[in-house]
């Protein structure tokens, strides 16, 4: 049967016994700069294309040893919650990835800078419909990586990221707090917000809305045909990615500015229990959680 | 995320170091009462001392970016100082990733051009 | 274009070994495995597993378990398949296919056993 | 792996619309997105028709469409012409591996 997470997002309309809009997001590219990925793991194949992009530090410690898997591991499953063939949000949708977190999950934010210069270039060069990107990613506040994100969001691009997993204010870190990127809080299954281990998601004025991101099934590069289920504001994020290249997909036109109005429209609203937030922050924290269009929009987003 | 926002530092460290009256030598002197600023995470565990993101003012060509780089690994030279240009930035953001010592964010800041520099920090999967 | 070569026909005796390679090319080799099918004389199609360009991970199907070796070699751009201690029921036509999604085919390699 | 049970087989006169079935489970056809159709000629390599239960191939024509409900999987052609006369496979995904129909020998009358 349908993910908790695909029923969620899914308008009443199309909650069958399974989640297919065949072509969704067919006429965008989603940029992810994670870990690397299993790019022809059954989920993905042929959906990803693997950029030539690296930029990541060592990893810590002397005793590190490197499981390819497990450097994958991340990047795989994200990109298989934007565009897996069986669990994936927007199924039709063409990805590339830029490696910038290490086997440890870790950059720098110099690294990602360069990857986002990468992209405006490739952008610039070959210049393609719509362009999402997807920062599964955080660091503390950072001037710079904000200024990076701001200039490639009036480039026209559209930036998804995650808002932290700190159990804090995302203005704190970064991209979470830069203004052009659309942030991403995770709840679960009971619209609460996420708890992991003694943190949990990130909330107040800098996120733009919440989606599912905990038990989330995607692509395991732990072999080719594996599933497993991981949470995070990561896997929040790559929801949101998804939704903003479907809509992206069915109107190509749309600004930045419009497809944020969208996506808050289309949210289910105060269905969060904000008790779950500092009491100055709740009604600094927006009580959406994200939703793919209904079905006046059917011949747009289901062709 | 969420548009309308002022800027939010939190409590980002800024710190502003200010420009010595004796100019180095330099062909281009800083314009006149603008004062470059240094930034890094606020968070102790996450800074990368010793890797610097200088930014420099938002219509600088490429050509003056490197410029800048090569004259800083210069004035670097003569002080003792080893200094490695990582990456020039062009195409979203004018500016280099330096490798060297923070011994010279004083002299680097006092560079045309010049806008901000940042200590590079770490980013973690979410 | 995509494209996928495969090596000539062999003939072979029981207890033998076979190896078909399969040469890739007009693709990111990486985004994808290749799955390699056979067809016995007037019979279907079966799957017999999948081999990685990306990392050379395999994943076979049961009934090949132990008999079958697939491998890669992304310097060449070549995959292979090996099967031994053949009896005359693998007589059949192998092919290669382009991952799971099996969207191009090999032209397919005539392996006949007999004694 | 059992394999997909499919009408061994299918005929039809120039012009007219067949439908092929093939009837799985709900551990591969009911369980995945991923239903393929392969057309092969005698002596020739099977050949894409339909991925991902309805989606065509760029160079396959329109006549042919794909649709699933529950555990049967369909490949409808309509329009049926000459060429069209080939065995014709089904294809589903499994949790671990791939699985074929029997094949279905479509006869153009």
């Known amino acids: 049967s349908i993910p908790w997470n695909l029923e969620r997002i899914t308008p009443p309309r199309y909650r069958a016994d399974e989640y297919q809009p065949p072509d969704g997001g067919s006429l965008v590219e989603v940029y992810l700069l994670d870990t690397s990925i299993q790019s022809d793991h059954r989920e993905i194949e042929g959906r990803v294309m693997v950029t030539d992009f690296e930029n990541v530090p060592e990893e810590d410690g002397t005793r590190f040893h490197r499981q390819a898997s497990k450097c994958d591991s991340h990047g795989t499953h994200l990109a298989g919650v934007v565009s897996g063939r069986d669990a994936g949000v927007a199924k039709g949708a063409s990805m590339r990835s830029l490696r910038v977190l290490n086997c440890q999950g870790k950059g720098t934010v110099s690294g990602t800078l360069i990857g986002l210069e990468f992209i405006r270039k490739s952008q610039l060069v070959q210049p393609v419909g719509p362009l999402v990107v997807l920062l599964p990613l955080a660091g503390g506040y950072s001037r710079v990586l904000n200024a990076a994100c701001q200039r490639l969001a009036r480039a026209g691009v559209v930036l998804v990221t995650a808002a932290g997993n700190f159990r804090d204010d995302a203005c704190l870190y970064s991209p979470a707090s830069a203004p052009e990127v659309i942030t991403v809080g995770a709840t679960n299954a009971q619209d609460q917000p996420v708890t992991l281990g003694t943190l949990g998601t990130n909330f107040g004025r800098c996120v733009d809305l919440f989606a599912p991101g905990e038990d989330i099934i995607g692509a395991s590069s732990d072999c080719s045909t594996c599933f497993v289920s991981q949470s995070g504001t990561s896997q929040a994020a790559a929801h949101v990615a998804g939704i903003a290249a479907m809509m992206l997909s069915a109107e190509p036109e749309l600004t930045l500015a419009e497809l944020r109005q969208r996506l808050i429209h289309f949210s289910a609203k105060d269905v969060i229990n904000e008790a779950w937030f500092p009491e100055d922050q709740r009604v600094l924290t927006p009580n959406l959680v994200a939703a793919l269009p209904p079905s006046t929009h059917e011949n747009l987003y289901f062709q | 995320g969420a548009m309308g926002q002022e800027d939010e530092d939190g409590d980002y460290e800024e710190l502003v170091l200010a420009l010595r009256s004796e100019e180095d030598g330099l062909a281009e002197a800083p314009e006149h009462g603008t004062t470059a600023t240094f930034h890094r995470c606020a968070k102790d565990p996450w800074r990368l001392p010793g890797t610097y993101v200088v930014v420099l003012k938002e219509e600088t060509h490429l050509s003056q970016s490197e410029r800048t780089a090569r004259r800083l690994q210069a004035q670097a030279a003569r002080r003792g100082y080893l200094t490695k240009i990582l990456h020039v930035f062009h195409g979203l953001l004018p500016g280099f990733l330096v490798k060297m010592s923070g011994d010279l964010l004083e002299l680097a800041l006092k560079l045309p051009h010049v806008d901000y520099i940042e200590e590079d920090s770490s980013v973690f999967a979410q | 274009q995509v494209q996928l070569v495969q090596s000539g026909a062999e003939v072979k005796k029981p207890g033998a070994s076979v190896k078909v390679s399969c040469k890739a090319s007009g693709y990111t080799l990486t985004s994808y495995g290749i799955s390699w099918v056979r067809q016995a004389p007037g019979q279907g199609l079966e799957w017999m597993g999948w081999?990685?360009?990306?990392?050379?991970?395999?994943n076979y199907a049961q009934k090949l378990q132990g008999r079958g070796t697939m491998t890669t070699d992304p310097s060449t751009s070549t995959a292979y398949m090996e099967l031994r201690s053949l009896r005359s029921d693998d007589t059949a036509v192998y092919y290669c296919?382009?991952?799971?999604?099996?969207?191009?085919w090999g032209q397919g390699t005539t392996v006949t056993v007999s004694s | 792996q059992s394999a997909l049970t499919q009408p061994a087989s299918v005929s039809g006169s120039p012009g007219q619309s067949i439908t092929i079935s093939c009837t799985g489970t709900s551990s591969d056809v009911g369980g995945y997105n991923s239903v393929s159709w392969y057309q092969q000629h005698p002596g020739k390599a099977p050949k894409l028709m339909i991925y991902e239960v309805s989606n065509r191939p760029s160079g396959v024509f329109n006549r042919f469409s794909g649709s699933k409900s529950g555990n049967t999987a369909s490949l409808t052609i309509s329009g049926l012409q000459a060429e069209d006369e080939a065995d014709y496979y089904c294809?589903?995904?499994?949790?671990?591996?791939?699985?074929f129909g029997g094949g279905t020998k479509l006869t153009v009358l």
């Open positions: 081999v990685s360009f990306y990392n050379g991970n395999t």
């Open positions: 294809n589903s995904y499994t949790s671990t591996s791939m699985v």
């Open positions: 296919a382009r991952g799971y999604g099996m969207d191009v």
